[in-house]
Interface confidence: medium
Amino acid sequence: RAPRCRELPAQKWWHTGALYRIGDLQAFQGHGSGNLAGLKGRLDYLSSLKVKGLVLGPLHKNQKDDVAQTDLLQIDPNFGSKEDFDNLLQSAKKKSIRVILDLTPNYRGENLWFSTQVDSVATKVKDALEFWLQAGVDGFQVRDIENLKDASSFLAEWENITKGFSEDRLLIAGTNSSDLQQIVSLLESNKDLLLTSSYLSDSSFTGEHTKSLVTQYLNATGNRWCSWSLSQAGLLTSFLPAQLLRLYQLMLFTLPGTPVFSYGDEIGLKAAALPGQPVEAPVMLWDESSFPDIPGAVSANMTVKGQSEDPGSLLSLFRQLSDQRSKERSLLHGDFHTFSSGPGLFSYIRHWDQNERFLVVLNFGDVGLSAGLQASDLPASASLPTKADLVLSTQPGREEGSPLELERLKLEPHEGLLLRFPYVA
């Protein structure tokens, strides 16, 4: 008799794939044209990335550092109208993209929480949650919560409002902190909060250190659902050396939890790579005309258009990973086990019941390495086969689908491999 299938865990929509942050509508759409109506025209692109949620804004009226002139219920006219927003929600819903609204109050100012008037701001946030939930948003984000006095209790209250409306609504909190104890204390009082932080960016970017960061985080947070990013708002390129971008994409998409990206991460967009750009919100490079003022500043391989046509590009890798992440049970909610694989490497396995299993091997080093996969670290339920099929490599030159002998696995510098193998009873 076939073994009984393991009962599937309850899956919320944000468990099923990546979130995509658009913190600056105008920078995302290109010079001078950034509004909600224009964003609607980019939803097909977001669909092609297979992201499950769009973290948008802030969009509300905010006069820098002025509480009285900050209205969390009003959309800044520069971005469009409430009607434009409603249309965007409807269009996104048709494409199965959820919309999360950033309500960080003083987003144009110095202190994002008007530190001297926390209580009145907290009341505004409460009212705004109720208003925008009624309007149909799927969740909220608040950033810089380390600057919010008594953050835990405010977050608990806001989460109650959000979840009280529907368990299917999400609250995301962002912090610049990379301190695990601080992060855990924020999470402890909020059972379903998704927290983005600088935790992973506080790394020496070696296999051993990254492995210990990930395992410590998972151990500290227990069996709660995690999110994975390198910061609460920034681009991957701001934290990573260029040669590790692909490796981190592979890692973020295959760790147990929700990967969270910022617009441009999928093409390796750099903060202030081009003259005259603001560091925090570089212009999205849709095509070579994205920077009309400076002819030749943008080459095709930096753009969405150019990378879409190149199967070996970072964008193509992102799409492939996002696709796998959203459809494979072992990657959606599978168990996670790390095991020793030698200096410079971080390796782990994802498996769920009798579904296809995935092995991830990441070489953070700048030399080629033999992966001495020490499978004796693994439990019996997750043992490794003799061979596994290559789903993808972060480097060119390997044939997808080809079986690789695990006993003789060699990785190029900065190469990551995603391998699959079947469950064997």
């Epitope: 001495g372 670290d377 019996a380 003799t386």
Partner: antibody
Framework: EVQLVESGGGLVQPGGSLRLSCAAS????????MHWVRQAPGKGLVWVSR????????SYADSVKGRFTISRDNAKNTLYLQMNSLRAEDTALYYC???????????WGRGTLVTVSS | DIVMTQSPLSLPVTPGEPASISCRSS???????????LDWFLQKPGQSPQLLIY???NRASGVPDRFSGSGSGTDFTLKISRVEAEDVGVYYC?????????FGQGTKLQIK
């Protein structure tokens, strides 16, 4: 403590059979490739056989092919070497060893002595 | 089968002096991806073998840095920069490029 302990050795007549066992503790045997290596008294080391983690693939030295069978019972965390048609030249200390993927033997047992004599 | 040949078979050394053991294989142990599948073991009297060097030149964890491995293809060397009394025993090279795995005959290091 991570260790391998061999047992089942002893005195046997030529043509006879023995079954060696190697019990693993402190780690999950099912996740490791395992090997048998032997050493005749006063002589060097000789590789005998290996088995992959799920038991689906085995290899043997020519000198024992067709007579020895390597197997494993992952539920019991135990590796076996079934030795049939034993000869005097099979007399040796038999070690089981764990293979660290792609690299080396990282864990050895203390060995069990097999003596084939009439 | 790949034949492994060690020399010398016996090596008397004065403590504090260097020592060198050679190992030659009948065919190249260099894998297409760049690693040499050759390991060095030490078997101390009455003990199981212990790993010293793997993949030609990588020191195993816990092995003193006076031990080093070098070479590529078919010619390999194990060097001990300053021999200590605890280094006595038989040293084996072993190829793990392909089965059947094969060992050298062993080199017996003794203290003079």
């Amino acid at each position: 403590e991570v260790q391998l302990v061999e047992s089942g050795g002893g005195l046997v007549q030529p043509g006879g059979s023995l079954r060696l066992s190697c019990a693993a503790s402190g780690f999950t045997l099912s996740s490791s490739w395992m090997h048998w290596v032997r050493q005749a008294p006063g002589k060097g080391l000789v590789w005998v056989s290996r088995i992959n983690s799920d038991g689906s693939s085995t290899s043997y030295a020519d000198s024992v092919k067709g007579r020895f069978t390597i197997s494993r019972d992952n539920a019991k965390n135990t590796l076996y070497l079934q030795m049939n048609s034993l000869r005097a030249e099979d007399t040796a200390l038999y070690y089981c060893a764990r293979w660290n993927w792609g690299w080396y033997f990282d864990l050895w047992g203390r060995g069990t002595l097999v003596t084939v004599s009439s | 089968d790949i034949v492994m040949t060690q020399s010398p078979l016996s090596l008397p050394v004065t403590p504090g002096e260097p020592a060198s053991i050679s190992c030659r294989s009948s065919q190249s142990l260099l894998h297409s991806h760049g690693d040499n599948y050759l390991d060095w073991f030490l078997q101390k009297p009455g003990q199981s073998p212990q790993l010293l060097i793997y993949l030609g030149s990588n020191r195993a964890s816990g092995v003193p840095d006076r031990f080093s491995g070098s070479g590529s293809g078919t010619d390999f060397t194990l060097k001990i920069s300053r021999v200590e009394a605890e280094d006595v025993g038989v040293y084996y090279c072993m190829q793990t490029l392909e089965t059947p795995y094969t060992f050298g005959q062993g080199t017996k290091l003794q203290i003079k």
